[in-house]
Amino acid sequence: RQQWELQGDRRCQSQLERANLRPCEQHLMQKIQRDEDSYGRDPYSPSQDPYSPSQDPDRRDPYSPSPYDRRGAGSSQHQERCCNELNEFENNQRCMCEALQQIMENQSDRLQGRQQEQQFKRELRNLPQQCGLRAPQRCDLEVESGGRDRY
């Protein structure tokens, strides 16, 4: 491959190593768990007042929850921090895809059943858009036990 492409890969690799994608994983897991819980009850009934102080001082969020997440400050804060992390990949769509793939791989063992995996994948694809960022055009989020060709 061409030199610049190799340099791009190295830059992406180091960017991925520095990134903290945990808030994205937490945000998505909470989101799909809430969506499962919300069958049979009002999906917008708040489980926590976004302005009430919680035990963790870092969760006192001055914002009302985003339109995508009206159910409590904890997850709203995970979403903001996740979006900050993804914002760093905004100018490198291929690397953004790698970040999304990494989130999928990190959480694949925790997903229970095909339905939850599909739901997680769907939410993951929507994540850049929810952050107000451009989503990668083609991004394979399939996880195979024997590894996979990413492109």
């Epitope: 985003s66 996740c82 979006c83």
Partner: antibody, heavy 122, light 110 residues
């Protein structure tokens, strides 16, 4: 409650490097943007630059050649280094958190330190 | 380099209404600059009043409102009070993550 505290020498000699540290307490520094802002006595505020916890930075173009910012997530701290200082760099230096309102690109400073006064003089 | 302009000083009578503006040396200010407004009492750190053109920060009285007026961002204070007397700064968000402060407006409540 998340609090910010600036620290560093109050007096720096001309041509030397000004170094300040901002310590974040009561919450995590991780996955947020952090900034430095300064204010010379009796004058307005000037944005110096921002740093993300991965270490990526954006600087004020007029200061870019002299500014370096760094972050130490293990200590919950981020730092400012300003080289070749002159009397014009005498100011109160503030650190602040920069928030982004998801899913927009609306940014604003929501938390500020109290500021630390730095005088450049021989 | 981009210069963000504000009235150096402005005065208002107690109970009156005043509008502070924030312009650009070249071109018009629009919502895409995500203007925000900060209040600074002498000797203190600034505090956020308005962000994203017109969203009031938590705990800010509704006497403070933000908007775009013509080609400038504007901060309007209605029912001005003695303790509104201080400095006000606007900030515009430029490309590449750069933010620029206006020169500030000193508000006097006469």
């Amino acid at each position: 409650q998340v609090q910010l505290q600036e620290s560093g020498p109050g007096l720096v000699k001309p041509s030397e490097t000004l170094s300040l540290t901002c310590t974040v307490s009561g919450g995590s520094i991780s996955s947020y943007y952090w900034t430095w802002i300064r204010q010379p006595a009796g004058k307005g505020l000037e944005w110096i630059g921002r740093i993300f916890t991965t270490g990526s930075t954006n600087y004020n173009p007029s200061l870019k050649s002299r500014v370096t910012m760094s972050v130490d997530t293990s200590k919950n701290q981020f730092s400012l280094h300003l080289t070749s200082v002159t009397a014009a760099d005498t100011a109160v230096y503030y650190c602040a958190r920069l928030r982004r309102v998801v899913p927009t690109a609306i940014w604003h400073f929501d938390l500020w330190g109290r500021g630390t006064r730095v005088t450049v003089s021989s | 380099q981009t210069v963000v302009t504000q009235e150096p000083s402005i005065s208002v009578s107690p109970g009156g209404t005043v509008t502070l503006t924030c312009g650009l040396s070249s071109g018009a200010v629009s919502t895409s600059y995500f203007p925000s407004w900060y209040q600074q009492i002498p000797g203190q750190a600034p505090r956020t009043l308005i962000y994203g053109t017109n969203t009031r920060s938590s705990g800010v009285p509704d006497r403070f409102s933000g908007s775009i007026l013509g080609n400038k961002a504007a901060l309007t204070i209605t029912g001005a009070q003695a303790d509104d007397e201080c400095d006000y700064y606007c900030v515009l968000y430029m490309d590449s993550g750069v933010m620029v402060f206006g020169g500030g407006t000193k508000l006097t409540v006469l």
